[in-house]
């Protein structure tokens, strides 16, 4: 980006830039960020008994240590390793649900199907879900005014690197049959540039993952097309098959009925297709 070019060309240190330079294109850190992370950690460890040994103050310290005082366009996955270590957690085989561009439905599903887990149902994903954060180089301050935008400023920003790091780890630890929910209303049902397409797909371990099953969620009520035949789904199938992982695909024509049938599987209307 332009700011990085200035940085490189002039060989100046970040802290020598005037204060007004530290303006980014993205929104600033979510208000009450430290309090929110700490409260979420306490609540999570409360309801997930196997995580009750976790010291939430240490989690916050590790989270803070990943980005505070660091140039917010030069964050690395290494910066998050202390946090990742503290948040180590495993998902039972066959219980991992990945998603791409359809977060709300994926989360509604795991809120009902309590034995399946998205990344945001794990401690680290739960802590950071829907939050933004960044610091400032050489100060201990959190920047509540602005943070780097992935497109306009830089990709190695605190939020993007966090999600890349934890998504990689989540995919690496998955086993059995892994499910992914995809948005059938988008032009690219499978997008190679999404976190799923660029990180998770490539970090599923063939020696542990037998199959990837895609659930393509239809948007229109009258949409009866077989979206499993979409070219981007075929592309996903090719990528997965080359990695020696079997691929399956299902159309979910009625997401509302799908959720209702997860809630009440004995309902007679659930015996027909969804």
């Amino acid at each position: 980006s332009g700011l990085n070019d200035i940085f490189e060309a002039q060989k100046i240190e970040w802290h020598e830039l005037p204060r007004w330079r530290q303006q980014w294109s993205g929104s600033g850190t979510t208000s009450r960020f430290p309090e929110t992370v700490l409260a979420r950690c306490v609540k999570y460890t409360e309801v997930h008994p196997e995580m009750r040994h976790v010291d939430c103050q240490s989690v916050w310290d590790a989270f803070k240590g990943a980005f505070i005082s660091k140039y917010p366009c030069n964050i690395t996955e290494e910066d998050y390793q202390p946090l990742v270590k503290l948040g180590t957690q495993t998902v039972p085989c066959n219980k991992t649900l990945l998603w791409s561009r359809i977060k709300d439905l994926a989360h509604q599903f795991t809120q009902v199907q309590r034995d399946m887990f998205t990344l945001e149902d794990m401690l680290l994903g739960y802590l950071a879900d829907d939050l933004t954060w960044c610091g400032e180089f050489n100060t201990f301050e959190i920047n509540y005014q602005s943070c780097p935008d992935w497109r306009k400023d830089c990709s190695n920003n605190p939020v993007s690197v966090f999600w890349k790091t934890v998504s990689r780890r989540f995919a690496e630890t998955a086993c059995g049959v892994v499910h992914v929910m995809l948005n059938g209303s988008r032009s690219k049902i499978f997008d190679k540039n999404s976190t799923f397409g660029s990180v998770e797909v490539h970090n599923l371990q063939p020696e542990k993952v037998q199959a990837l099953e895609a659930w393509v969620i239809h948007g229109g009520r009258e949409d009866s097309r077989d979206l499993c035949q979409d070219p981007t789904i075929k592309e996903l199938e090719s990528i997965i098959s080359k990695r020696n992982i079997r691929f399956f695909c299902k159309n979910i024509y009625r997401p509302d009925k799908f959720l209702q049938c997860v809630k009440n599987p004995e309902d007679s209307s659930c015996l027909s297709g969804i």
Epitope: E46, V47, P49, P92, K95, Q111, Q113, R114, D115
Partner: antibody
């Protein structure tokens, strides 16, 4: 260590009622979960809600959200507020504790004797 | 949405015999083993028998045995005594602070 419920009564449909659970011989530690479970006459047990003593975070059965409110009022008391009562809410209401210590997690090891709520016109 | 189905009900047993009660969960319980068994007699609150699927609660006779994992659990009462006549409930814990009870199984001792 014991729990005891109070506040059960005969009320008319549409009425509200508050039940109280009181701990004797101990106070709720920060990790202690205090919960309410009910049992309609001749029927099975039904979980309603829990509150965590240390954080006052609350957890409800999906059917109980909105009409039932669980609150911690002191280090030894928890209440359950019930609104818009119907005949279907007629039951014995039990207070139960999930200690959340060591391996004691996810089940109720301490129960009160129960208090009867009757909703009838 | 978290449904625990107990079978059979009622079940009858002769003194000295064996009773087996099944509890099937519609979803895997937390950690595959967060399941407890309770005994309840008329006019009394439930009494904890088994927790963590197979651990015997304090003071409970070893005639009571819990087994199972994930979605299928069993309570076995061997050498049944007349005092074992009661209703038995399974209770599960799920991720997110959710508890659920089975519908109960009445044990009649002949």
């Amino acid at each position: 260590q014991s729990l005891e419920e109070s506040g059960g009564d005969l009320v008319k449909p549409g009425a509200s009622l508050t039940l109280t659970c009181t701990a004797s011989g101990f106070s709720f530690s920060s990790r202690y979960w205090i919960c309410w479970v009910r049992q309609a006459p001749g029927k099975g047990l039904e979980w309603i809600a829990c509150i965590v003593a240390g954080t006052t975070n609350t957890y409800y059965a999906s059917w109980a959200k909105g009409r039932f409110t669980i609150s911690k009022t002191s280090s030894t008391t928890v209440t359950l507020q019930m609104t818009s009562l119907t005949a279907a809410d007629t039951a014995t209401y039990f207070c139960a504790g999930d200690p959340r210590t060591g391996s004691n997690v996810g089940y109720f090891n301490l129960w009160g004797p129960g208090t009867l709520v009757t909703v009838s016109s | 949405a978290q449904v625990l189905t107990q079978t059979p009900s009622p079940v009858s047993a002769a003194v000295g015999g064996t009773v087996t009660i099944n509890c099937q969960a519609s979803q895997s319980v937390y950690n595959n083993n967060y399941l407890a068994w309770f005994q309840q007699k008329p006019g009394q609150p439930p009494k904890l028998l088994i927790y963590s699927a197979s651990t015997l609660a304090s003071g409970v006779p070893s005639r009571f045995k819990g087994s199972g994992s994930g979605t299928q659990f069993t309570l076995t009462i061997s050498e049944v005594q007349s005092d074992d006549a009661a209703t038995y409930y399974c209770q599960a814990y799920y991720s997110g602070g959710i508890y659920a009870f089975g519908g109960g199984t009445e044990v009649v001792v002949k």
